[in-house]
């Protein structure tokens, strides 16, 4: 947020940039939380724009019985590993095809025991306030589907008739990690010393980090003809004086007609 300064007063302005603002030779360059000619004003809204998507990662282990382990499979750059990765990925894409949040799989390690496949199942969903529930549901479906396929696709008489066969007892879910996104916490952090006065309100499922000085929200402070200004003690209305009136009161809702006051003073003189 920048405010340009023209004229002789600029040199004086340079030394007066407030709240960590820096002079660039023409204007005060204000940190995120401030604006104004001297960076003296606190912004009324902070962009905490949620990520477009939220991700989850499930650490799984399955045992593939239709492939015999060979030393080449330890080397991730070998042709054998690459071929196994392609077939395993294709198989998992089929297994999880009905899950809209499914992105893919990432093999982390192959080890002996037929072939024990340590891998991550990657999930992603569009950000909504309900993203945790969406991803929790998706992880449950992943568990169901992998349990089902590793129970059904098994070797019969040492032969597999599917793309891959599995050991029913070799399927384990080690860990589930969901990217954490907490708009309330982000809002508080970014508002720094004004954190007590900034809140998150939702519009079209998008979170907005706002102070009561931001108009159009349920927490918005109505200063009438005055101006809402944030201070360390909270939002305050700075009341204006017009040609005809003085305004006062907590929300500048009390107007005093100047002519009455002047008339009153004039009467006293």
């Amino acid at each position: 947020r920048t405010t340009t300064c023209f004229g002789d007063g600029c040199q004086n302005t340079a030394s007066r940039c407030k709240n960590g603002g820096t002079w660039d030779g023409l204007k005060c360059q204000c940190p995120n939380l401030y604006y104004g000619e001297l960076c003296e004003e606190v912004v009324s809204s902070i962009d905490i724009g949620p990520p477009e998507t939220i991700s989850a990662q499930m650490e799984l282990t399955v045992t593939v019985t239709s492939v015999k382990f060979t030393e080449e499979l330890k080397n991730h750059s070998s042709q054998e590993f690459q071929e196994f990765k392609q077939t395993f990925t294709e198989q998992m894409n089929i297994v999880y095809s009905g899950i809209p949040e499914y992105v893919g799989v990432n093999i982390t390690k192959l080890r002996l025991g037929s072939v024990v496949v340590e891998h991550d199942v990657l999930l992603r969903t569009k950000y909504t306030p309900e993203y945790k529930t969406v991803l929790d549901n998706a992880t449950e479906v992943v568990k169901e589907k992998i349990t089902k396929v590793t129970t059904q696709q098994i070797m019969i008489n040492d032969i597999c008739s599917d793309m891959m066969c599995f050991n029913t007892t070799g399927t384990q879910v080690q860990n589930i990690t969901v990217t954490q996104y907490d708009p309330e916490e982000d809002c508080r952090k970014m508002a720094k010393e004004y954190g007590d006065y900034f809140v998150v309100e939702y519009r079209d499922q998008k979170p907005y980090c706002i102070s009561p000085c931001e108009p159009g929200f349920s927490v918005s402070k109505n200063c009438n003809l005055g101006k809402c200004q944030m201070s360390l003690s909270g939002p305050q209305c700075l009341c204006v004086t017009t040609e005809t009136h003085w305004y006062s009161g907590e929300t500048c809702n009390q107007g005093t007609q100047k002519s009455l006051v002047y008339g009153h003073h004039h009467h006293h003189h």
Epitope: S66, Q79, E80, Q86, T87, I159, S161, M163
Partner: nanobody, 123 residues
């Protein structure tokens, strides 16, 4: 680049024999798995037989005792000796390969394929 080229197909009478060959280039035939598949008109591709790098073999029930799969690592070749042929053996026969030691007769597990050779059993 892996290339598999089949040969040896043709017309044969019921009860007769044929030997199919598959020449593999760019594929280390001493490794992984090589297999024969077949596809009859209007039917799905099915596994006939496969052989692993250590010589382990497996056959479909319908060809057991009649067909023999073998590989010659020195010549980088795969063979299928077919005896006592029947009308139901009529199909296009494909050679397939994988660098992995596979124990599956599912076509989706094999990334490398030949163009196929036609075998017709008819009197």
């Amino acid at each position: 680049e892996v290339q598999l080229v089949e040969s040896g197909g043709g017309l044969v009478q019921p009860g007769g024999s044929l030997r199919l060959s598959c020449a593999a280039s760019g594929f280390p035939s001493s490794r992984g798995t090589m297999a024969w598949f077949r596809q009859a008109p209007g039917k799905e591709r099915e596994g006939v037989a496969f052989i692993n790098s250590d010589g382990r073999t497996s056959y479909a029930e319908s060809v057991k005792g009649r067909f023999t799969i073998s590989r010659d690592n020195a010549k980088n070749s795969l063979y299928l000796q077919m005896n006592s042929l029947r009308a139901e053996d009529t199909a296009v026969y494909y050679c397939a390969a994988s660098l992995l030691y596979l124990m599956t007769v599912n076509a989706a597990a094999y990334p490398y394929w030949g163009q196929g050779t036609m075998v017709t059993v008819s009197s």
